[in-house]
Structure formats: structure tokens, C-alpha cells
């Protein structure tokens, strides 16, 4: 999607959130996948009638991606080459490198809650010793 | 260059009608959500909309909620304020500035329009 | 809504001086803090996002950090630009709020 955007940090860390802050985020948790393959990222929003402004999908201190309620997804430049959109809400990491091991955060953009931040943490391993839940594994 | 350009200020007496407007440029403006921020003289900032990039999203101050009305054209890169019964309290410097992609702050701001409410 | 409370409303300075200002969130902001400057006449500028991101094209003298409720604005050495008004912001919920603004004199 064509984005004019001067730079891409971006904040992380746990939501503060609206006074009547009900919801929860669900995440994958931990996670890993072998070198070369690909994972899904997925949180899930619930118990709250917040509407859903935007998502933003980030590793540590770098912005990875939004999806934004009105202009649909964007996928920061530099990583486009290896994040695709979806499935829903969620990123889809594709030729995993052990580089990608780390803390992804899902920020949810709401209102009036405010925000929403949901953890993730990927490993990402040299040999076929990676489990995790076919669900959330791309063959 | 990213340029945003208020306009439509003035003065008008209590209970009237003005209609600001922002000109963008240097921007794909329909990518973006934008804002209404106003600084009353000599005094700080006031956040007073919200609009998101395609219009679904809208929120007020409770200050200007049913008086004020914000909207957008995309295919002019313009932004509005419509503003109703106007208040001596809403005489200020009003802004228009540019929602970061990301949605953490307010990155480009025009330089302002005045508008002074009294009789 | 979020109080905003910044610290001090106003500041001497000499050019070269180290210069810290606070802003205190009412509640849990997260990192969700913005700072702006904001010349006599003009427009506010964006300096720092996310608590301590700084925008594009700032420069590096200015640093934010903090998280919760208690933010700090650092500007290492005070340049003669410097000299202006400060104001923190939350970027967390709505209606975004801003602090009253600290004002950088010369001395």
C-alpha cells in the first residue's frame, strides 16, 4: 500500500489504556520455527466493545507493519520482502533467519480504550527441533 | 515538502458559524488521519478532532462535541472544522496536523488560523 | 480524560546547559508521550514520540525517556533555538491531552 512515511520506530511495551478498560489480548505466547521457514503472528482482541482503529505489528523498537481500519495494510519497507499481511489481524514471517528471534508486540489502536499490547516472543532455531502448534505453522 | 495550510478564520460574534479548512500537499493526504489543535491566546494546546483517513473514524473534545463538525474531502487534500455556536471560550489559534502513519503524535502541523468569537 | 501535569511551567537557562523537564500522566500512559516545541508565532514541532522515539531530522541533543506516569524531556546542551515552549502530550487514549507547557528563557 503506498505509504509516505519519513521513518519507522515505533514505541512498544504494555498498554495504559481507557478508564472502562476491559479487554484482553490473546497472543500466540512462545513460539518457534525453524531457519528458512515461516510463522504466524496472531493476537486477538476481546471482552471489549472498543472499536479497532489500527493495528501495529512491531519487533522491539521496529515497525513491521499496520493495519489500519480505513487504508488496509502496510508493510514497512524494509521488511517487505518477508512479511506478508494476515491471516486477519495477524503477520505472516516468511525466510526466518536465527536474526528474527526476539519480542514482537501487537499494539492495538482503540477507542475509546486507548491502547492494547499484546507480547509475543519467537525463536527461531537452526534445526528441525522447532514445536509449536500446527495452527500457527506454515509448512 | 509536507505543507499544510489553514484558512477561514475570523471574527464572528457568539452563536455564530465559521468553517475552517486545511490544504494539504506534499503527501499522499488520504493515507493519513488528521487533527484539529487550537491555543487559545496566550494560553497551551487544546486538542479538538480527529478524523481518520477514510472517515470512519471521528472523535471531539467534549469541549466542541455537537457543536463542531470535522470532515475531509481526499480528492481535494483538504480537511474542515465546521464550527456552530461558537463560544467567546473557543476564540483561539486553530491547527490542523497530520496523524504519524504509526499513530504516535502529531508529526506536521500548519501555521494556524485565528478566530475570534465576540460581540 | 488524562491530567497532564508538567514541571516547571517556566525555566533560566544559559546556552550550553543540560535542561530536563517532567510531565506526570494522571494514569498509565504506557510510552505513549509525545514532546513539542513551540516558538512564539508558530506552529508546534514535533520532537519525540513514543516517550523516547525521536522524530526524523531532531536533533540528537533532545532525548525523552520515562514510562507509566513520569516522563522526562532532556535537551543536553541548550543551543540559542532552544529557547522556547515546551509541551508534553499523551498519545495513548482520547481526548488527547496536553501538559501546560514549560517555557525556556535565556538567562
Known amino acids: 500500500y503506498p505509504y509516505d512515511v519519513p521513518d519507522y520506530a515505533g514505541g512498544g511495551g504494555s498498554g495504559g489504556g481507557g478508564s472502562m478498560m476491559t479487554g484482553t489480548i490473546e497472543t500466540t505466547g512462545n513460539i518457534s520455527a525453524e531457519k528458512g521457514g515461516s510463522i504466524i503472528l496472531q493476537c486477538h482482541l476481546s471482552s471489549t466493545t472498543a472499536q479497532v482503529t489500527q493495528v501495529n505489528w512491531e519487533q522491539q523498537d521496529q515497525l513491521l507493519a499496520i493495519c489500519n481500519a480505513d487504508a488496509g495494510w502496510h508493510i514497512s519497507p524494509s521488511f517487505k520482502d518477508r512479511v506478508a499481511p494476515g491471516p486477519g489481524l495477524g503477520l505472516t514471517l516468511q525466510s526466518l533467519t536465527v536474526n528474527d528471534t526476539g519480542e514482537y508486540f501487537c499494539i492495538y489502536h482503540t477507542y475509546p480504550d486507548g491502547t492494547y499490547t499484546g507480547r509475543i516472543f519467537l525463536e527461531v532455531l537452526e534445526s528441525s527441533v522447532a514445536e509449536h502448534g500446527a495452527r500457527f505453522q506454515i509448512p | 515538502e509536507v505543507q499544510l495550510v489553514e484558512s477561514g478564520g475570523g471574527l464572528v460574534q457568539p452563536g455564530g458559524s465559521l468553517r475552517l479548512s486545511c490544504a494539504a500537499s506534499?503527501?499522499?493526504?488520504?493515507?493519513?488521519?488528521m487533527h484539529w489543535v487550537r491555543q487559545a491566546p496566550g494560553k497551551g494546546l487544546e486538542w479538538v478532532a480527529f478524523?481518520?483517513?477514510?472517515?470512519?473514524?471521528?472523535y471531539y473534545a467534549d469541549t466542541v462535541k455537537g457543536r463542531f463538525t470535522i470532515s475531509r474531502d481526499n480528492a481535494k487534500n483538504s480537511l474542515y472544522l465546521q464550527m456552530n455556536s461558537l463560544r467567546a471560550e473557543d476564540t483561539a489559534v486553530y491547527y490542523c496536523?497530520?496523524?504519524?502513519?504509526?499513530?504516535?503524535?502529531?508529526?506536521?502541523w500548519g501555521q494556524g488560523t485565528m478566530v475570534t468569537v465576540s460581540s | 480524560d488524562i491530567q497532564m501535569t508538567q514541571s516547571p511551567s517556566s525555566l533560566s537557562a544559559s546556552v550550553g546547559d543540560r535542561v530536563t523537564i517532567t510531565c506526570r500522566a494522571s494514569?498509565?500512559?504506557?510510552?505513549?508521550l509525545a514532546w513539542y516545541q513551540q516558538k512564539p508565532g508558530k506552529a508546534p514541532k514535533l520532537l519525540i514520540y513514543s516517550g523516547s522515539t525521536l522524530q526524523s531530522g531532531v536533533p540528537s541533543r533532545f532525548s525523552g525517556s520515562g514510562s507509566g506516569t513520569d516522563f522526562t524531556l532532556t535537551i543536553s546542551s541548550l543551543q540559542p533555538e532552544d529557547f522556547a515552549t515546551y509541551y508534553c502530550q499523551q498519545h495513548n487514549e482520547y481526548p488527547w491531552t496536553f501538559g501546560g507547557g514549560t517555557k525556556v528563557e535565556i538567562k
Open positions: 496536523a497530520r496523524m504519524r502513519l504509526d499513530y504516535y503524535a502529531m508529526d506536521y
Open positions: 494514569k498509565s500512559i504506557s510510552k505513549y
Open positions: 478524523i481518520s483517513s477514510g472517515s470512519s473514524s471521528i
Open positions: 506534499g503527501f499522499t493526504f488520504s493515507n493519513f488521519g
